[in-house]
C-alpha cells in the first residue's frame, strides 16, 4: 500500500512524507524563515533604508546573510544530487510497483519540489542582489564615514590645541590680574598716604601763601616808598651838582645817568631785564599815579600788559562806570585793569591787542589786532581796532567801527535796550554786538544758550559762554 502526507514538525519546518509499503520517504525542505519578515529592514523585498546604520551592526548582519546564502546553495546542490541519484531509481521502482494514482502523487511532489526550488532560487537571486546593493552602499558609507572621521579628528585636534592655548593664556591673564590687583591695592594705599601728606602740605602752603601775600603787600608798599625816596635823592643830587658846577669851573662833574625806576607798561619792564611773569607796578604816563598790573612775560615773546582776565567767576564784572574806569579785581586772578590807564597808555604810542580765549572743551583761540586804542572818557572810552588776524574768527567780534563803552549805570550803546543791564558787565556794546568778555560767568554744562554769558560770536556762536579770557596789550614796535 502507499499514501502521501504533508505536515509541519515540532520545530515548525515543513515536511513531505511518502509511504510505500514498508518504505517511508521523508523530504525536509529548506527554511524560508531565515529571510526575515517584512518588519525587518533586511527583508528581501523591503525598501532599503537611506540612513546609514551602525557600521559594526551592518557588518554582522551582512555576515549572517552570507552564511544563509551559502547554506541554501549547498542544500540545493545536495537536493539536486539526491534527486538525480536516488529519485531516478525510486521513480523507476515506483512506476513499476505502484498503481497509477501513486504516479500522480509522485508527479505532484516533483512539481511541488520544482516549484519550491524555482521560488527558492528567485528568492536567493533577490537576496543576492540586495546583499550586493547593501554591500555597495555600506562601502560608500564606510568611505564617507572614514573621511568625516578624519576631518573630525583633525578638527578635534585643532580645537584641543586651541583650548590648551586659551587655557594657558587664561592662566597667564589670571595671574596678571592678580598681580595688578596687588599692585593696585598697593598704589591705592600709597596714593591715600600721598593724599594725606598733600593735604597737610596744602594746609601748610596755604598759611605760607597767606603770610607771603601779607609780606608782598608790605614789600610793594616798601618798594614804592624806596622808589620814591630814590627818585627824590636823585633829584637832590642833580640839583646839588647843578649848584656846584659854575661857568668858570675848570672841570665838569660827571653825572651818572639815572636808572629807570618807573615803567609805563610791561614791555619796558621786560626790556629792563625783568622777564618773569607776575604783578608789577606801572606808572600812568606824565604822572606819578601808579597801578598794579599782571605782566605776561611768556606768551609770544613776553612784554604783555594784561588788561582783562576771566578764569573762574570769582569776581563780579557787573560794575559801575567808575569801577571800570579805575579798575577792579585782583591781578593774580580775575580783573579789569582800568579804562583810564589803558586810554592814556594807548593814546601815546601804537599798541597791539591780543585776546586769548578758552572754551570748555579744551580748545584755545586768539584774535590779534595790529592797532588798538581807547578814546578818552569824554568819548566814552570808544574802542578803535584795525588789522585782525588769528584763530578766533575771520570777522571781528568787537563791532566795527568801534562802539562806546557802556556799564549798568552808563548806557552808551546803539540799542533801544540797555545792553549792559541785559547782557551783564561793562563792554563796548553795539546793539548789543557779537562779543562781551565781561559777561556773566557760567560753569561747565551751564554755559550754552546763554544770552548774558562770556561771548565771542565769531568763534563759538551767540549762546556759548567761554571758560577763560585774557586781553593783553604791547607796543607795536616791541
Amino acid at each position: 500500500y502507499s499514501n502521501f502526507r504533508k505536515s509541519v514538525d515540532s520545530t515548525g519546518r515543513r515536511q513531505y512524507q511518502v509511504q510505500n509499503g514498508p518504505c517511508s520517504y521523508t523530504f525536509l525542505l529548506p527554511e524560508t524563515d531565515s529571510c526575515r519578515s517584512s518588519s525587518s529592514p533586511y527583508m528581501s523585498n523591503a525598501v532599503q533604508r537611506d540612513a546609514p546604520l551602525d557600521y559594526d551592526d551592518s557588518v554582522q548582519r551582512l555576515q549572517v546573510l552570507e552564511n544563509i546564502l551559502e547554506n541554501n546553495t549547498q542544500w540545493l546542490m545536495k537536493l539536486e544530487n539526491y534527486i538525480q541519484d536516488n529519485m531516478k531509481k525510486e521513480m523507476v521502482e515506483i512506476q513499476q510497483n505502484v498503481v497509477q494514482n501513486q504516479t500522480a502523487v509522485m508527479i505532484e511532489i516533483g512539481t511541488s519540489l520544482l516549484n519550491q526550488t524555482a521560488a527558492q532560487t528567485r528568492k536567493l537571486t533577490d537576496v543576492e542582489a540586495q546583499v550586493l546593493n547593501q554591500t555597495t552602499r555600506l562601502e560608500l558609507q564606510l568611505l564617507q564615514h572614514s573621511i568625516s572621521t578624519n576631518k573630525l579628528e583633525k578638527q578635534i585636534l585643532d580645537q584641543t590645541s586651541e583650548i590648551n592655548k586659551l587655557q594657558n593664556k587664561n592662566s597667564f591673564l589670571e595671574q596678571k590680574v592678580l598681580d595688578m590687583e596687588g599692585k593696585h591695592s598697593e598704589q591705592l594705599q600709597s596714593m591715600k598716604e600721598q593724599k594725606d601728606e598733600l593735604q597737610v602740605l596744602v594746609s601748610k602752603q596755604s598759611s605760607v601763601i597767606d603770610e607771603l601775600e601779607k609780606k608782598l603787600v608790605t614789600a610793594t608798599v616798601n618798594n614804592s616808598l624806596l622808589q620814591k625816596q630814590q627818585h627824590d635823592l636823585m633829584e637832590t643830587v642833580n640839583s646839588l651838582l647843578t649848584m656846584m658846577s659854575s661857568p668858570n669851573s675848570k672841570s665838569s662833574v660827571a653825572i651818572r645817568k639815572e636808572e629807570q625806576t618807573t615803567f609805563r607798561d610791561c614791555a619796558e619792564i621786560f626790556k629792563s631785564g625783568l622777564t618773569t611773569s607776575g604783578i608789577y607796578t606801572l606808572t600812568f604816563p606824565n604822572s606819578t599815579e601808579e597801578i598794579k598790573a599782571y605782566c605776561d612775560m611768556d606768551v609770544g615773546g613776553g612784554g604783555w600788559t594784561v588788561i582783562q582776565h576771566r578764569e573762574d567767576g570769582s569776581v563780579d564784572f557787573q560794575r559801575t562806570w567808575k569801577e571800570y574806569k579805575e579798575g577792579f579785581g585782583s591781578p593774580l586772578g580775575e580783573y579789569w585793569l582800568g579804562n583810564e590807564f589803558v586810554s592814556q597808555l594807548t593814546g601815546q604810542h601804537r599798541y597791539v591787542l591780543k585776546i586769548q580765549l578758552k572754551d570748555w572743551e579744551g580748545n584755545e583761540a586768539h584774535s590779534l589786532y595790529d592797532h588798538f586804542y581807547l578814546a578818552g572818557e569824554e568819548s566814552n572810552y570808544r574802542i578803535h581796532l584795525t588789522g585782525l588776524t588769528g584763530t578766533a574768527g575771520k570777522i571781528s567780534s568787537i563791532s566795527q567801527p568801534g562802539s562806546d563803552f557802556s556799564t549798568k549805570d552808563s548806557d552808551n550803546d546803539k540799542c533801544i535796550c540797555k545792553c549792559s543791564q541785559m547782557l551783564s558787565g561793562g563792554w563796548w556794546f553795539d546793539a548789543c554786538g557779537p562779543s562781551n568778555l565781561n559777561g556773566q560767568y557760567y560753569p561747565q554744562k551751564q554755559n550754552t544758550n546763554k544770552f548774558n554769558g562770556i561771548k565771542w560770536y565769531y568763534w563759538k556762536g551767540s549762546g556759548y559762554s567761554l571758560k577763560a579770557t585774557t586781553m593783553m596789550i604791547r607796543p607795536a614796535d616791541f
Epitope: 563791532s399 535796550c417 545792553c419 553795539d430 554786538g433 557779537p434 561771548k455 560770536y457 551767540s462
Partner: antibody
Amino acid sequence: EVQLLESGGGLVQPGGSLRLSCAASGFTFSSYDMSWVRQAPGKGLEWVSLISPDSSSIYYADSVKGRFTISRDNSKNTLYLQMNSLRAEDTAVYYCAKDLISFWRGGFDYWGQGTLVTVSS
Amino acid sequence: QSVLTQPPSASGTPGQRVTISCSGSSSNIGSNYVNWYQQLPGTAPKLLIYSDSHRPSGVPDRFSGSKSGTSASLAISGLRSEDEADYYCGAWDDSLSGYVFGGGTKLTVLG
C-alpha cells in the same frame, strides 16, 4: 531810521511757489538775526523762520520745514523767503522782522508793513 | 493750538489796571526772555516789552512786564481807549528751536 520793506506777495495756486524779499535800511543789517512772521486772516502771529547774521544758523517752524527756505544777502541788505509747495493754510500776511539785539535771538523790535500771500485755486 | 497760552480776551474801563497772563514751559518762558507785542487794528505788531520787563524808549511807563517761573504777565495801568488792541507774548523755545507766540489777547476798553 530803521525800515523794512517786504515785496513778492500775491495770488498763487496750491502747489505753486513764491519768493518774498525784504529790503532793510537804517541799521547794520549784517549784525542782526532776521525773521519771517506770518498772520493768517483773523488769526494770531506765527513765527516762520530765522536766519543768523552770517547765515550759519537757520531755524524753521515745523509747519514750513522742507518747503520754505530763508536766505539773506548782506551786501544787498536783503532778506528772502522762498516758498514752495504752497498750501491753502499758508495764506497770510508775511512780515519781515528785525531782532531786537544783534547776534542774539531776543525778540523783534522792528517789523515791515507785511505782504499778503493768497494760496487759492 | 499755541505753545504759549493767553486768555483770548480782556477788558477794562478807562483808568483801570488790566493784567494779561502768558503761560508757557521750562523750555520757553522758563529759560528765555519774554517779549510783549501790541498790534493795533490794521497795522504791523510793535514791541512793547522786551527781556521780561524792559520798555523800549517811546513806550509809556503805564505798560509793565514781569515774569515768574514759566509764566509772564503784562500789566496796563491807567487804561486808555488807544490801548484797545491785540497783545501777544513771545519767547524763544529751546526744545522747538524756534520762536513761539501766545494766541493773542484782544483788549477792549469799555465805555
